[in-house]
Interface confidence: medium
């Protein structure tokens, strides 16, 4: 026999971004609780199956009322430790769950109401007569700090309380038959009662002659482990003694689950998965109805008024199993495309986007062109999620990658000629054109489009193709920097565009999740 | 110069936990996703998770079954991956490398941590 | 997971010559594929992303082509420093997977 001891250190808001609203406040004032559960061995922690090795419940801590305006504050706890009895062995290897409530002491009709904050659980080896352990545990935005520690109550001592002592019966020796008792120098360890080849390491016993067994074995002198049978599926090495197979830790052997469930190895363990209307770690716990609120984590219970009819429990996100007992990594679903990072919030999962990508699961595929896809000096221009290249003169092909001939298309009309330029081709017209390819005749009508050339300057000379060549090249520039202010603007849009599309199809995505 | 130092060599036992540093230099720490990437001998390249250093959010490969803790120190500059309940497979070379924030996953990569676990 | 298949395994290729390596995703990534040199002594080094863009600073005889699940690098003119170890990635969805790498030799 022994005491699991808890004591909580500090429950309030974690580290990182979103801290979590007070649970209190002016209007509202309320003082925390809390509850621990105690189950043996390595079991599913979750809240389904009976707080076998015990549980307890905290004193009310002091009253509080938020601050207008102030960072929520780590919440006043209630004084003292938390103690959970044990009155077999103390398992060494267990399960706890540890609840956060809250008491709102308003005016509430029908006295004070309860709600769960926060519901923290793991899996943990200890053994008794150790020191301390100290943890913390997030749950949602709120942090949980505690310690904890399993001791043997008198005359019990040892790592699983399983060794009995006695006083002394001299100052100075033990009395026949008994060996002094570490660390307690003032006692003597009791003489071995146990069934005569009991196994020392996995079997205790508190009257003579008995065998009890620890969590994990079992047999008439603790030596089998449990779920394992006998000689038909041999796994591990020969038996000299009885000449059959002794079956290795086979978990799943024989079948550990009771009432039709199904058995499934877990890395350490085995998982049972129950039929309705059974639960508990082997399935064992039967004739549940909703009187006995099997759903958890906020599960609805619908059906099973009477104890031989089943019950199902509708689980809120985030939860499945039969008693929605199993968190559900949603995140492992792998929601989010194109490399997102994925948050699953509780009541949603959201996707956080890398640069150039947007949606809900970050599926639209904002910015092409972030990548200087387009090669020797060529532009990158986006559109319909895909990019195409405008390419610097002499380069051509879908990535500016392939060297092109400007003149090669013969760009120059009413044989005008073509000349490669660092600034673009350039076209030097036949006499009575003009144009930047030479598209447009000098006398539309008959009469001069331009004024008459000076003298000595005929209308096909160089100086003029010069000036008229420049006239092209600052239209030019003047289209590109307007090009390049359209497409700012219509990206801005479209970002815009995205990010209420993103608004929007969030609940679409969080209903479609749960389906 | 974008730069990732990675800490030494280690030498672990069966069943014991490895913590390997990446110390950033040359950018925005918190700017920049950072990968880690692990690669047993004569094997290819396995991606082990992501981690975002401004505000710890990551994504992990769940081959490794929660065994896989990834960190960062920001104010140091400096990420973490510790990887626990090691086994004799987990004898690899362990890279970190920068995410791009553009669309290209790993534009910089460490030098690399030699671990491994024999008994 | 979306298992990426590398061929050929080891590649040997004349000085000038061309090097071509494939790779072959079990489902379409898009266009979401890279490509890395792996030389000892080195830090690994990106060459190609979204399977056909070009990072700064890496030569031009590299070159990638392909969409959906098929795609190529190329080494349009193999150089001695050339001579390395080639993954392809696809950073399509998590978790990011590898190709099992393509070892390049001159003949």
């Known amino acids: 026999a022994g005491v699991f001891e808890l004591q909580i250190h500090s429950f309030g808001p974690g580290p990182g971004p979103g801290a979590p609203r007070s649970p209190c406040s002016a209007r509202l004032p309320c003082r925390l609780f809390f509850r621990v559960c105690l189950k043996p061995g390595l079991s599913e922690e979750a809240a389904e199956s009976p707080c076998a090795l015990g549980a307890a419940l905290s004193a009310r801590g002091p009253v509080y009322t938020e601050q207008p305006g102030a960072p929520a504050p780590d919440l006043p706890l209630p004084d003292g430790l938390l103690q959970v009895p044990f009155r077999d062995a103390w398992p060494g290897t267990f399960s706890f769950i540890i609840e956060t409530w809250r008491e709102e002491l308003g005016d509430q009709i029908g006295g004070p109401a309860w709600s769960l904050l926060a519901r923290v659980a793991g899996r943990r080896r200890l053994a008794a007569g150790g020191p301390w352990a100290r943890d913390i545990q997030r749950a949602g935005a709120w942090e949980l700090r505690f310690s904890y520690r399993a001791r043997c109550e008198p005359p019990a001592v040892g790592t699983a309380c399983t060794r009995l002592c006695r006083p002394r019966s001299a100052p100075s020796r033990c009395g026949p038959g008994l060996r002094p008792c570490a660390p307690l120098e003032d006692e003597c360890e009791a003489p071995l009662v146990c069934r005569a080849g009991c196994s020392p390491e996995h079997g205790f016993c508190e009257q003579p002659g008995e065998c009890r067994c620890l969590e994990g074995w079992t047999g008439p002198l603790c030596t089998v482990p449990v779920s394992t049978s006998s000689c038909l599926s041999p796994r591990g090495p020969s038996s000299a003694t009885t000449g059959c197979l002794v079956p290795g830790p086979g978990p799943c052997d024989g079948n550990p689950c009771a009432n039709g469930g199904s058995c499934s190895e877990t890395p350490r363990s085995f998982e049972c998965t129950c039929p309705r209307g059974f639960y508990g770690l082997r399935c064992e716990v039967s004739g549940v109805t909703c009187a006995d609120g099997p759903c958890f984590n906020g599960g609805l219970c619908v059906g099973g008024a009477d104890p031989d009819s089943a019950y199902i429990c509708h689980c809120p996100p985030g939860f499945q199993g039969s008693n929605c007992e199993k968190r559900v990594d949603r995140c492992s679903l792998q929601p989010c495309r194109n490399g997102g990072l994925c948050l699953d919030l509780g009541h949603a999962l959201r996707c956080r986007c890398r640069a150039g990508f947007a949606g809900p699961r970050c599926e639209h595929d904002l910015d092409d062109c972030a990548g200087r896809a387009c090669a020797n000096g060529g532009t990158c221009v986006e559109g319909g999620g895909a990019h195409r290249c405008s390419c610097a003169l002499g380069f051509g092909g879908r990535d500016c990658r392939e060297r092109a001939d400007p003149c090669a298309a013969r760009p120059c009309a009413h044989g005008g000629r073509c000349y490669a330029h660092f600034s673009g081709l350039v076209c030097a017209c036949a006499p009575g054109y003009m144009g930047a390819r030479c598209e447009f005749p000098v006398h539309p009508d008959g009469a001069s489009a331009l004024p008459a050339a000076p003298p000595g300057l005929r209308p096909g000379d160089p100086q003029r193709y010069l000036a008229g060549v420049i006239a092209v090249i600052v239209v030019v520039v003047i289209a590109i920097v307007a090009g390049i202010v359209v497409l700012v603007i219509s990206r801005k849009k479209r970002m815009a565009k995205y990010e209420k599309a993103e608004i929007k199809e969030m609940g679409e995505m969080h209903r479609e999740l749960n389906a | 110069e974008v730069q990732l130092v990675q800490s030494g060599a280690e030498v672990k036992k069966p069943g014991a936990s490895v913590k390997v540093s990446c110390k950033a230099s040359?950018?925005?720490?918190?700017?920049?996703?950072m990968h880690w990437v692990r690669q047993a001998p004569g094997q290819r390249l396995e991606w082990m998770g992501v981690i975002d250093p401004s505000d710890s959010l990551a994504n992990y490969n769940q081959e490794f079954k929660g065994r896989v803790t990834l960190t960062v120190d920001t104010s140091a500059s400096t990420a973490y991956m510790e990887l626990s309940s090691l086994r004799s497979e987990d004898t690899a070379v362990y890279y970190c490398?920068?995410?791009?924030?553009?669309?290209?996953?790993?534009?910089?990569w460490g030098q690399g941590t030699t671990v491994t676990v024999s008994s | 997971d979306i298992v990426m298949t590398q061929s050929p395994d080891s590649l040997a290729v004349s000085l000038g010559e061309r090097a071509t390596i494939n790779c072959r995703a079990t489902?379409?990534?898009?266009?979401?594929l890279a490509w890395y040199q792996q030389k000892p002594g080195q830090t690994n080094k990106l060459l190609i992303f979204s399977g056909s863009t070009l990072q700064s600073g890496v030569p031009d005889r590299f070159s990638g082509s392909g969409s959906g699940t098929d795609f190529t690098l190329t080494i349009s003119s193999l150089q001695a420093e050339d001579v390395a170890v080639y993954y392809c990635q696809q950073h399509h969805e998590y978790p990011y997977t590898f190709g099992g790498g393509t070892k390049v030799e001159i003949k």
């Open positions: 489902k379409s990534i898009s266009k979401y």
């Open positions: 040359g950018y925005t720490f918190t700017s920049y996703w």
């Open positions: 490398a920068r995410d791009s924030t553009v669309v290209a996953p790993m534009d910089y």
